[in-house]
Interface confidence: low
């Protein structure tokens, strides 16, 4: 995969609102998260029971649906070592990265369909200048898609598209912490499409998350949780073919 | 075809530490999602939760009980072990394995396959 | 932790006609996200738990459609529509909403 972009510029310099090189306009974002503060909801899927938890492909045994979500062996390489060839953010002219992340990467997950729901793991946490990149294609008539940055029991960033919430698309962002969810930030604009392939990428900043989403910026999301090096893994879910998942140092 | 089977000692001595395994097949604990866990039974009794593990090593304990409940995994081996320190003769029970399923979004499944369970007495 | 609370026994059923088993929940299990985390096991006599019931509606594989399951967040009853001698066993509720988790008492359905 070749980026027609650099990220480099993303984060030297502050104060700037449209950093040259992030994904698409930057200028012109509302405050928060969406520009939804305060917004709540009474349950992501009133008068109706969930559609399960892996839509389209239920778990063997108490789970009505096609089986094979899991088909008894581990998915191959899911917890790979850094890939030998190189990866899709060239180091040239990027800041060498330190700490737990001691080269650019990216790691992750191989090239490859993988099995959904994954979990990448984030050894180390995450840490500012940490690039999260997820590629796959929303499959027809889905329902939601989620990314789950989890601290133990916690999740410090859900990050939850729903594609037919009372007829309506949006996208919810959620904090959980001692299993209670918090205030929800929700964001109108939907760049997802069922069936279409799809670019999700999360910047982690010092105090905040950026997404974009097929290189266009799409919302930020202040850190509830401030422990960032606990933040130690990333769960994958939802109505998608995962192609990859990866981690670099920008 | 998903089966599990506990195995014990049958019976032990007040003080001694149970160890437990549970041999499962038709799932693997290295699939993101599985989990597998501990609930025992006293006879005529109801169900009481004891410890889970996660595909990711994460441990869910029942901290409402004694403390010495340790559990762990060999996914390679389809195994998941439960050590309880300090037994006594309340804890005379069916120690139950059972298998669930973890959604980051959707949450917890119900526990949907159970070994038969083994029989443990603790007596003096 | 979250109490769960059942009747030991139900009220006498005869074959063929329905019957109820309540359960209720020292908290509410619904979930900000839409999903209420209760469980139904049935215990047959002599054998393992089986689920019937997760997510407070949701049937589980196998399980015939006599079983229904309904409820409030605190609230919850499971119904079985036409009592065959099979049902028999012990009925138990249980919550995965919070650590830990915890099964109601159970209860025994018993038949005329």
């Known amino acids: 995969m070749a980026d027609n972009f650099s990220l480099h510029d993303a984060l030297s310099g502050s104060g700037n609102p449209n950093p040259q090189g992030w994904p698409g306009a930057w200028g012109n974002q509302p405050a928060g998260a969406g520009g939804y503060p305060g917004a709540s909801y009474p349950g992501a899927y009133p008068g109706q029971a969930p559609p399960g938890a892996y839509p389209g492909q239920a778990p063997p045994g108490a789970y009505p649906g096609a089986p094979g979500a899991y088909p008894g062996a581990p998915a191959p390489g899911v917890y790979p070592g850094p890939p030998s060839g190189p990866g899709a953010y060239p180091s040239s002219g990027q800041p060498s990265a330190t700490g737990a992340y001691p080269a650019t990467g990216p790691y992750g997950a191989p090239a490859g369909p993988l099995i959904v729901p994954y979990n990448l793991p984030l050894p180390g946490g995450v840490v500012p200048r940490m690039l999260i990149t997820i590629l796959g294609t929303v499959k027809p008539n889905a329902n939601r898609i989620a990314l789950d940055f989890q601290r133990g029991n916690d999740v410090a960033f859900h990050f939850n598209p729903r594609f037919n919430e009372n007829n309506r698309r949006v996208i919810v962002c959620n904090t959980k912490l001692d299993n209670n969810w918090g205030r929800e930030e929700r964001q109108s604009v939907f760049p997802f499409e069922s069936g279409k392939p799809f670019k999700i990428q999360v910047l982690v900043e010092p105090d905040h998350f950026k997404v974009a989403v097929n290189d266009a910026h799409l919302l930020q999301y202040n850190h509830r949780v401030k422990k960032l090096n606990e933040i130690s893994k990333l769960g994958i879910s939802g109505d998608i073919d995962l192609t990859s998942a990866s981690y670099t140092m920008i | 075809q998903v089966t599990l089977k506990e195995s014990g000692p049958g019976i032990l001595q007040p003080s001694q530490t149970l160890s437990l395994t549970c041999s499962f097949s038709g799932f693997s604990l290295s699939t993101s999602g599985m989990g597998v866990g501990w609930i025992r039974q006293p006879s005529g009794k109801g169900l009481e939760w004891l410890a889970h593990?996660?595909?990711?090593?994460?441990?869910y304990y029942n901290t409402a009980l004694k403390s010495g409940l340790t559990i762990s995994k060999d996914a390679s081996k389809n195994q998941v072990f439960l050590k309880i320190a300090s037994m006594d003769t309340a804890d005379t029970a069916t120690y139950y394995c059972?298998?669930?399923?973890?959604?980051?979004?959707?949450?917890?499944?119900?526990?949907?396959?159970w070994g038969q369970g083994t029989s443990v007495t603790v007596s003096s | 932790d979250i109490v769960m609370t059942q009747a030991a026994f139900s009220n006498p059923v005869t074959l063929g006609t329905s019957a109820s088993i309540s359960c209720r929940s020292s908290k509410s299990l619904l979930h900000t996200n839409g999903i209420t985390f209760l469980y139904w096991y049935l215990q047959k006599p002599g054998q393992s738990p089986q689920p019937l019931i997760y997510q407070m509606s949701n049937l589980a594989s196998g399980v015939p459609d006599r079983f229904s399951s309904s409820g409030s967040g605190t609230d919850f009853t499971l119904r079985i529509s036409r009592v065959e001698a099979e049902d028999v066993g012990v009925y138990y509720c249980?919550?995965?909403?919070?650590?830990?988790?915890?099964f109601g008492g159970g209860t025994k359905l018993e038949i005329n």
């Open positions: 059972a298998r669930n399923l973890y959604d980051g979004s959707y949450g917890y499944y119900a526990m949907d396959y």
């Open positions: 593990i996660w595909w990711d090593d994460d441990k």
């Open positions: 249980a919550q995965n909403l919070e650590l830990p988790w915890t």
